[in-house]
């Protein structure tokens, strides 16, 4: 008789999830000498232990604590780039500007980027059919709790000038309900962070508006100022040129506004 299986609203665990996590870990530790001591099998065991045999709506930060310890890694705290709704450009930027880091440039962020995972209560099976959706099912699911945990702690590590890349093409350039708006903003440490600098990325080629005057950016400024952190904002009118100028800063066309 087939066992009854909970049907969730979200997509199931990414296929070949264990193999993907293990392979990513091996690749990361090979590329980053400071992480060569990491035992990737132990990392996978800790990752698996966070959600296997547990109800996928009842996951806690504590479940991920063994994984967090195994993935301990310091990042230059004044070289942190946060992002919201513009992941690809943020990652393209840090691939060129190698001394800056997004969360996905760290071991744990790299392992989990773009993956989905969940288990089932009281069985050692991974659920490849469906996983809880944050809105439709529950917020304390394995994926959401993981990202909330690492995002909070990444923001807590930041210092001096912290940068955030925001998507100027969206109706809410700053969204209070995004991970940046709901977690990272509130976990920047005022005693360590002097300034949050927002980079608003324009979408349209002919868009010359000052999106730093957008009401949602003003809302972000207000939240940040109340936390005794200074705020600054820059328009990136041409993201393609922006990336090009990061690659080749000596280019004569890079002295003008981008």
């Amino acid at each position: 008789v087939p066992r009854w299986r909970q049907q969730w609203s979200g997509p199931g665990t990414t296929k070949r999830f264990p193999e993907t996590v293990l392979a990513r870990c091996v690749k990361y530790t090979e590329i980053h000498p400071e992480m060569r001591h990491v035992d990737c099998q132990s990392v996978w065991d800790a990752f698996k232990g966070a959600f296997i045999s547990k109800h996928p709506c009842n996951i806690t930060e504590e479940d991920y604590q063994p994984l967090m310890k195994l993935g301990t890694q310091t990042v230059p705290c004044n070289k942190i780039l946060l992002w919201s709704r513009i992941k690809d450009l943020a990652h393209q930027f840090t691939q060129v500007q190698r001394d800056m880091f997004t969360l996905e440039d760290t071991l744990l962020g790299y392992l989990a980027d773009d993956l989905t995972w969940c288990g089932e209560f009281n069985t050692s099976k991974i659920n490849y059919q469906s996983c809880p959706d944050w809105r439709k099912d529950c917020s304390n699911n394995p994926v959401s709790v993981f990202w909330k945990t690492v995002s909070r702690r990444f923001a807590e590590a930041a210092c001096d000038v912290v940068h955030v890349m925001l998507n100027g093409s969206r109706s809410k350039i700053f969204d209070k309900n995004s991970t940046f708006g709901s977690v990272e903003v509130h976990n920047l440490q005022p005693e360590k962070v002097q300034t949050l600098e927002a980079w608003v990325i324009h979408g349209g080629r002919e868009d010359s508006r000052d999106l730093c005057q957008d009401p949602t950016i003003k809302e972000l400024e207000s939240i940040i100022s109340k936390r005794n952190i200074q705020f600054s904002c820059k328009n990136i009118y041409r993201p393609d040129k922006f990336l090009q100028c990061v690659k080749n800063p000596e280019d004569s066309s890079c002295t003008s506004e981008i």
Epitope: K69, T72, V75, C77, R153, A157, C159, K192
Partner: nanobody
Framework: QVQLVESGGGLVQAGGSLRLSCAAS????????MAWYRQAPGKQRELVAL???????NYADFVKGRFTISRDNAKNTVNLQMNNLKPEDTAVYYC???????????WGQGTQVTVSS
Amino acid sequence: QVQLVESGGGLVQAGGSLRLSCAASGSSVSMNSMAWYRQAPGKQRELVALITPGDRINYADFVKGRFTISRDNAKNTVNLQMNNLKPEDTAVYYCNIGATRPPFGAWGQGTQVTVSS
């Protein structure tokens, strides 16, 4: 692997001085925020002082004017000079790098400071 080792603790009379040192390996003190925390018996761990790569320095109100945090990039150490010590400064002093919780931070094992009256 990030490791922090504290030294310099001990027993001192009220009004005396001590210099704590924290040696880091596996990470650079010049690129991370470095902090000293302390924990007295039966109390929560509390921030004493911190320094960032941009030399943003913060002290807890209870040590202002008495303690000085500094960094020695060449030796990869962070130091805490403690003057005019008081009995209430008695605690285990811990060195911290980065965040207070893993994965983006690490702690030393701590060094005991005892101030007798």
